[in-house]
Each structure stands twice: as C-alpha cells, then as structure tokens.
Amino acid sequence: EKSDLRTVAPASSLNVRFDSRTMNLSWDCQENTTFSKCFLTDKKNRVVEPRLSNNECSCTFREICLHEGVTFEVHVNTSQRGFQQKLLYPNSGREGTAAQNFSCFIYNADLMNCTWARGPTAPRDVQYFLYIRNSKRRREIRCPYYIQDSGTHVGCHLDNLSGLTSRNYFLVNGTSREIGIQFFDSLLDTKKIERFNPPSNVTVRCNTTHCLVRWKQPRTYQKLSYLDFQYQLDVHRKNTQPGTENLLINVSGDLENRYNFPSSEPRAKHSVKIRAADVRILNWSSWSEAIEFGSDDG
C-alpha cells in the first residue's frame, strides 16, 4: 500500500479505517447512534465533508487528492456518549521522490498520453506506475504502455479510453529497493485535457458574388454537440505583402457549419483554414489544411 495510517484516538476507539482504492472511510457502528459526521482536513486547512452513507458508519470522498497528506476525522454521538477519532494519512517516503510535472492530454478523440518527471531525490532504481480511476470508481485502469527514459517509466500511452468518465483520478505510485517513494495523485477533467483535431471536410464553393465555406465538427472524446464548439476561420489572400494581417473570423458552432462571405469575381487566389475549440475553454486545435480558391490572375 502507498501510505502508513496512524490513528489518534481516545481509549474506546471507533476503529476508523480508510481504503484509498474506494476513497471510503469507515468505522465501527455504535448502538443507538444519534449523530455521525466525517470529514478530512488537508495541509492547507481546507475541510471536505462528504455525505454519509445510508448505514451512517462510512462515508466516501469523491473529489480529493491525498499526496500532500490529509487528516480524517470521525465524530459519533450515541444516546450514552460521544466518540471522536482522527486518522492521519501521510504521504510516506522520502520527500521529493514522487513523480512531478504530471500532465495528460487526450488527442485524436480516443488516445491519451500522460507524462511525468522523476522526483529530484528519487534513487536511480526508482520505478513509477500509473493507475487511473474514473469518478464512478467502478474500475481501475493500469497503464498498458509505458514511455521509458533509461528504464524508468516517465509516461503512459492509452489507446482505449472507454473506462474514463468526465472526471478521473490519476495516481502515480513509486517503488525502489533503497527507500520509500512518495506517491503523486491528481484529479483531471477530460474536457480540460482534450486537444481537438481540426475541423474536417472543409470545402469552399463560390458564385459570382460570394464564397461559402462549409466544414464538419471534429470528432471528440467528450460527448459534445454543435453548440459546444467555437470556430476560427483564417481567410487569407495569397501573395500579399509580408505583415499584412489575416482576416480571422469567429463562428459559433451550428447544426450546419458554414460561413458565407462576399467575394466578387474576378477573385484573387485565397486560402482558408479553420480551427476548433470548446466554446467554454477556447483551447484551440491546430489549423486544418489550407484550402485554396480563386485564381492567380484574379
């Protein structure tokens, strides 16, 4: 297991225990309980108090990271007396051995890369392992393909994201024969880590007075519909003086993605490219391939 648990309790103990796999804190049920409460306090003195489970002898923490160390606390009142117990959950191991600079990104709608760096005080034989649990905590994903640097795991590639949900818990454990290695954990929203592909099927059709650009929204990992997208069009006249500003047009996502603009014949050679973003985050994709229209002698 990744950490030592130390109990601070009065004489008659509630036998408080914490399961880091399920994030479930439980204790011995007391007869004639009138009041129960559980919470944790982190190193920044933030308090998290989850809803109690139905049987009132356990509670489940959903959105928490543990690598900075936390203290769990349970208060129980019965008709006879009150109980109180603390459970320290430190991140044991040598300081500075945990994986650092951890980040993940989803790309191509169904692939994910996570990367990290070895801790500055980690010994040469350190090995890191990545585990991912979705917010429903139904299953744990172990990294299937590690990225290595001199034999040490410093990244992970996943080509099956079916086990993920909108918010996921990432845990990087470490092992060494020499010393204890601290763990690192993080909660990540898939919507914040997805990098969109550029829009597809970009076409330009022109008549004598106008040009109509059409495109399809990119395929994404998240369940997004047309209103969730924002697009930027770069309509660019070819062979212009360097430093001439491109025309960047913002277009909201629609059922039929199109942009109609005046452009009369004869028209000079132009190019258009499009990029996409989540309308709420504006994390822009790369540009689509430039499509050319018009003629050199326009």
Epitope: K223, S225, Y226, L227, D228, L255, E256, V279
Partner: antibody
C-alpha cells in the same frame, strides 16, 4: 435547413398508448441526439429522455420509466416516442428536440409539437 | 412545481430594459451547471435564446443577454420590442433529478 416535423394531434382514452413521430430533414439522424420534452399548463416543461452518446443508449427520466419507450429508425431519419398507460394528466404538447449541448442538456432546435389529449 | 423559480410576469414599455430572474439550488445552477434560456412565442414551439449562461445562437439579436452567479441566473432584454412579447423559460441540469430541469416561465408583456 434542418427541420423537425412531428406527427399530428392525438386523442386517446385513459389506459391506452400513444406513438408520436419526429422526422428529421436536412440532416442525418445518426449524427444527432434527439430528446423529448412535454409541456402542460400545470407542470410546465418536463424532460422525458433521449439518446445519450456516452452511454450509447436511450435514457429516460425516472418519473416516466416503465411507461415510455423512445426508438429511432435511422434509415428514414425518424424518432418515435411511445407513452403507455395514459392518464388524464398526460394531456400535453409533446416536443422532440435536437440536443445542442450535453453539459448541461440544451435543446438547440425544437419540433412544432404534437398535442396529445387523454380523455374518457 | 417547477425546479427553477422565475417571476410569473414582467412588463416594460417599448425601448425599455427588462430582466427576468431564475433561482435554483446547489444541485442544479449552483452545482455548477450552465443555464439556457428559451423563448416561446404564443402558440409556437420554444426557441433557444441563450446557452452556456451567456452565448447566443446565430440569429438571436444582441438585445438579449444573460448572466449567472451562484445559484441564480438572469436574462435581460434591452430595447424592448413588440415582438419580444412571449414566455421565457430558464433551464439547466440537475445532479439529483438528472436530465433537464426548467423554470415555470415568465410572461413578458410589452406595454
């Protein structure tokens, strides 16, 4: 131009079933998520359910579970709503809609509605 | 009983500014979920007016704007016009009820 064309008004007796259709034109149903919402003068708008791409199945509002069935025929771009064991308080206008966003559920485009009257 | 609370009616003279409030709770607007607004002209189907708290679909005039704070949201119509006379509904998602939840609607009358 994308449009949702709904079937005509229905009058049904209590205990009967009703099937409302919603034909999509100008777009392929297989690329869309259709949800159903009803409107009554007393309860206002009530979301009934629809296709959830994350679960890859049709999900139903709890209060209609067991009485409602939503189906789709992508070959003719048509969605259907069947409500059984009708009661007088099911008298409502039933709308199909195209989901514009899933978070939160946002109806981007609505059909004109189908009036269903339940009366003995 | 609607999950989201709106005033039953508001009114204003042409050219005036009117606002409609929408109050929810910690399981919906405060969860936090974005808010949408729909306009329903007499005898017609609803039309999406605002999505993701303050975004307008193409074709919706910029006289319509909206904002959200905490567990409530509001819709503002500036430069009120006769054609704005309609029912307006707020909507969002709810953690407990799941799916979409709506306000009871606000009738806007142009005096």
């Amino acid at each position: 131009q994308v449009q949702l064309v709904q079937s005509g008004a229905e009058v049904k007796k209590p205990g009967a079933s009703v099937k409302v259709s919603c034909k999509i034109s100008g777009h392929s149903l297989s690329e869309l998520s259709i949800h159903w919402v009803r409107q009554t003068p007393t309860k206002g708008f009530e979301w009934m359910g629809g296709f959830d791409p994350e679960e890859n199945e049709i999900v139903y509002a709890q209060r209609f579970q067991g009485r409602v069935t939503m189906t789709e025929d992508t070959s003719i771009d048509t969605a259907y709503l069947t409500l059984s064991s009708l009661r007088s308080d099911d008298t409502a206008v039933y709308y199909c809609s195209i989901v514009g966003s899933f978070s939160p559920l946002t109806m981007g485009l609505w059909g004109k509605g189908t009036m269903v009257t339940v009366s003995s | 009983q609607a999950v989201l609370t709106q005033p039953s009616s508001v009114s204003g003279a042409p050219g005036q500014r009117v606002t409609i409030s929408c109050t929810g709770s910690g399981s919906n607007i405060g969860a936090p979920y974005d808010v949408s607004w729909y306009q329903q002209l007499p005898g017609t189907a609803p039309k999406l007016l605002i999505y993701h708290n303050n975004k307008r679909p193409s074709g919706v005039p910029d006289r319509f704007s909206a904002s959200k704070s905490g567990t409530s949201a509001s819709l503002a119509i500036t430069g009120l016009q006769a054609e704005d006379e309609a029912d307006y509904y707020c909507a969002t998602s709810d953690e407990i009820l799941s799916g979409s939840v709506f306000g009871g609607g606000t009738k806007v009358t142009v005096l």
